[in-house]
């Protein structure tokens, strides 16, 4: 990119219509016959959706105003936010003694921005100051990108919480899940 990304310290998030559906119904799970039917969905932040393709790396559309100090864009910009999980849980339980350890059952993928686009926005400032033009970098698409255990913490921060996969032989902090831990991880699509 030949231009500097413009950092927005304050934005107003305006979710698009249709992003507030009713919560999903409870799923049934058989301990012996594990079934991953269409419709298994985890909670999403900040919204949930009934769309069966939801449990995946999804591109949520957000509309927001770009602000820079006292100045605000004349029109809101629409951008994508990458949301969701990339596949089933890839951690398998390892019972050692009385403690429960976890080990990976596959590479760890995270739903992250893939491509970006530049958009020029006009900022209106109070007190009759002249409008300013700025270029903002907006997410254009998302992908399920593989993480490695060699990613350092500063890199992981870019991928959001829960980005680090526990290494083999380590005892990780258990993930926060409800009583029915497996209910929320029944299906994905990439």
């Amino acid at each position: 990119q030949g231009w500097q990304a413009f950092k927005n310290d304050a934005t107003e998030i305006i979710p698009e219509l249709g992003e507030y559906p009713e919560p999903p119904p409870e799923l049934e799970n058989n301990k012996t016959m594990n079934r991953a039917e269409n419709g298994g969905r985890p909670p999403h932040h900040p919204f949930e959706t009934k769309d069966v393709s939801e449990y995946s790396c999804r591109e949520l559309h957000f509309t927001r105003y770009v602000t820079d100090g006292q100045c605000r864009s004349a029109k809101p910009v629409t951008e994508l936010v990458c949301s969701g999980q990339c596949g089933p849980a890839r951690l398998l339980p390892n019972a050692i003694g009385r403690g429960k350890w976890w080990r990976p059952s596959g590479p760890d993928f995270r739903c992250i921005p893939d491509r970006y686009r530049a958009q020029r926005v006009q900022l209106l400032c109070p007190g009759g100051a002249a409008p300013r033009a700025r270029k903002v970098r907006l997410v254009a698409s998302c992908k399920c990108k593989r993480l490695t255990r060699f990613h350092n913490q500063s890199e992981l921060k870019d991928f959001g919480p829960e980005a680090a996969r526990p290494q083999k032989g380590r005892k990780p902090r258990p993930r926060a899940r409800g009583a029915k831990a497996n209910q929320a991880e029944l299906e994905n699509a990439y």
């Epitope: 594990n34 991953a36 790396c57 890839r90 060699f150 029944l186 994905n188």
Partner: antibody, heavy 123, light 107 residues
């Protein structure tokens, strides 16, 4: 010996469903995610998705979303792949494959494959 | 999806020849590249993983190299049992994708 043994060939009509099984032996079934890959006649390989035998959690290639369901029966160490609304271009050999791991290089690969199940979709 | 392009799609060679197959990814896949060999009517077999790591039991005449987007599988001295189709596969981004295959035939 680590082995994946798949069910026999199937002939189906367009619009029907097929369910292919893959029985694992020689290793702890719940220790590895199972993947499914297909190969149309004279074509390359196409990854369909994966399932975690512990949780039943599955992840599918978006191309097959809504038509495929992967399941496991841990009591018999068997994985299943059901494909619905079959079309003629679903005619292919369907493989189950185990995802192996190299701890040193933190890398994954399909190290054990089933022998393949031929599914023919024809009216 | 990441496109994996193999070249050539087929080649004719003789026993003892040095054979090189290339695989190009449409975007950077680091070293997450595997190579498989498939013979007619059989399932694919893993040869090389993580670009250059030879699976135990695979003859040392097979080698892999590359990183980022360009990768190579080399057979230093082709043997009769090596006539087959070879596929590359990326493991960097979901969905996993394979190359179109390179068929190695007897000249």
């Amino acid at each position: 010996e680590v082995q994946l043994v798949q069910s026999g060939a199937e002939v189906k009509k367009p619009g029907a469903s097929v369910k292919v099984s893959c029985k694992a032996s020689g290793y702890t079934f719940t220790d590895y995610n199972m993947h499914w890959v297909r190969q149309a006649p004279g074509q390359g390989l196409e990854w369909m998705g994966e399932i975690n035998p512990n949780s039943g959690g599955a992840g599918y290639n978006q191309k097959f979303k809504g038509r495929v369901t992967m399941t496991t029966d841990t009591s018999t160490s068997t994985a299943y792949m059901e494909l619905r609304s079959l079309r003629s271009d679903d005619t292919a050999v369907y493989y189950c494959a185990r995802l192996g791991y190299d701890d040193i290089y933190d890398d994954w690969y399909f190290d054990v494959w089933g022998q393949g199940t031929t599914v023919t979709v024809s009216s | 999806d990441i496109q994996m392009t193999q070249s050539p799609s087929s080649l004719s060679a003789s026993v003892g020849d040095r054979v090189t197959i290339t695989c190009r990814a449409s975007q950077d896949i680091s070293n997450y590249l595997n190579w498989y060999q498939q013979k007619p009517g059989k399932a694919p077999k893993l040869l090389i993983y993580h670009t250059s790591r030879l699976l135990s039991g695979v003859p040392s005449r097979f080698s892999g190299s590359g990183s980022g987007t360009d990768f190579t599988l080399t057979i230093s001295s082709l043997q009769p049992e090596d006539f087959a189709t070879y596929y590359c596969q990326q493991g960097d981004t979901l969905p996993y994708t394979f190359g179109g295959g390179t068929k190695v035939e007897i000249k």
